[in-house]
Amino acid sequence: LQDPCSNCPAGTFCDNNRNQICSPCPPNSFSSAGGQRTCDICRQCKGVFRTRKECSSTSNAECDCTPGFHCLGAGCSMCEQDCKQGQELTKKGCKDCCFGTFNDQKRGICRPWTNCSLDGKSVLVNGTKERDVVCGPSPADLSPGASSVTPPAPAREPGHSPQ
């Protein structure tokens, strides 16, 4: 025998208390597929969350984060504070990237500058807290007359110009 609940479309639930009729989902609840025996409570985007898409009888609400925060986790399950470029979020708040590291986004951690010498290249542009170094041609490519690129002054590798 076919389950009578299988006839209940999205936006309804199979109400066992009422002879398995397909009752519409009550306000603030939804069912995104047919044959459901309950409707799920709509997600509420409160506090640091804001509503990106309203709930309906057939689909849950979707949240994103208020300005100054960004989403983390599946379906934006958490909001994390933004930092400035050149910073990372620690337990004590936003902190500048340590020397030799950078962050070019408002989220995430500071990452080490690229070590150009590992690829046999030289530093073309020094790194900053906000930007990675730019590696240039290898020193062997810089034989006299072979290139118009002026090699950087010998500095620590990777290089960092004083802020």
């Epitope: 006839n7 209940c8 479309p9 999205a10 309804t12 519409p24 989902c25 009550p26 009888s57 057939t58």
Partner: antibody, heavy 122, light 109 residues
Framework: EVQLVESGGGLVQPGGSLRLSCAAS?????????PCWVRQAPGKGLEWIGC?????????YDANWTKGRFTISRDNSKNTVYLQMNSLRAEDTAVYYC?????????????WGQGTLVTVSS | DIQMTQSPSSLSASVGDRVTITCQAS??????LAWYQQKPGKAPKLLIY???TLASGVPSRFSGSGSGTDFTLTISSLQPEDFATYYC???????????FGTGTKVTVK
């Protein structure tokens, strides 16, 4: 403009049939918006006739007194809902309203047509 | 079947009065109740849904309360445009689940 417009009312003899139409404009019936029929006899209160699921399924919700005489149907391509009334009696004389029952308004009737008068008399 | 009983069936009041109308369901309908206002020759207008939520554009002098079987519509300070008939309706969907109350006519004292 968001509105419901009923048509098809008029004078009909006892035992006769009539089909009322309700055309929706400015929105589409969906799982969030169910079309319903309500009637009001002269000088009397509101009486719920029934509703139909607004999406593609043909689930209907009806007042028990309508069974076998009144049938609600829908044509999604025309965004129109119908009330087929058979075996009409003098006591079916009333203004028939089409209403939109909305999930967003706790399934209350948040939009109503102007009504169409049905008179059953010989 | 769900039956909805309203009281009183009619009342006379003056502008500025506080008016209370009650509605009783024959079985529990949680908070699934709507209130409407209807003026002669016009379609009903939704005032309150989910027992206590004010519909869009409805003045704040209207309020609703209750849950289960007993519900109340209150007009805190009656205005000239509020003289009308008021209906409750169960929105507890299902066959015979959306019955209207018997109506309350509010007239000038």
């Amino acid at each position: 403009e968001v509105q419901l417009v009923e048509s098809g009312g008029g004078l009909v003899q006892p035992g006769g049939s009539l089909r009322l139409s309700c055309a929706a404009s400015g929105f589409s019936f969906s799982a969030n918006y169910y079309p319903c029929w309500v009637r009001q006899a002269p000088g009397k209160g509101l009486e719920w006739i029934g509703c139909i699921y607004g999406g593609s399924s043909d689930i209907t919700y009806d007042a028990n007194w309508t069974k076998g005489r009144f049938t609600i149907s829908r044509d999604n391509s025309k965004n129109t809902v119908y009330l087929q009334m058979n075996s009409l009696r003098a006591e079916d004389t009333a203004v028939y309203y089409c209403a939109r029952s909305a999930w967003y308004s706790g399934w209350g009737g948040d939009l109503w047509g102007q009504g169409t008068l049905v008179t059953v008399s010989s | 079947d769900i039956q909805m009983t309203q009281s009183p069936s009619s009342l006379s009041a003056s502008v500025g009065d506080r008016v209370t109308i009650t509605c009783q369901a024959s079985q529990s309908i949680s908070n699934r109740l709507a209130w409407y206002q209807q003026k002669p020759g016009k379609a009903p207008k939704l005032l309150i849904y989910s027992a206590s939520t004010l519909a869009s554009g409805v003045p704040s002098r209207f309020s609703g309360s209750g849950s289960g079987t007993d519900f109340t519509l209150t007009i805190s300070s009656l205005q000239p445009e509020d003289f009308a008939t008021y209906y409750c309706q169960s929105t507890y969907y299902g066959n015979d689940g959306n019955a209207f109350g018997t109506g309350t006519k509010v007239t000038v004292k």
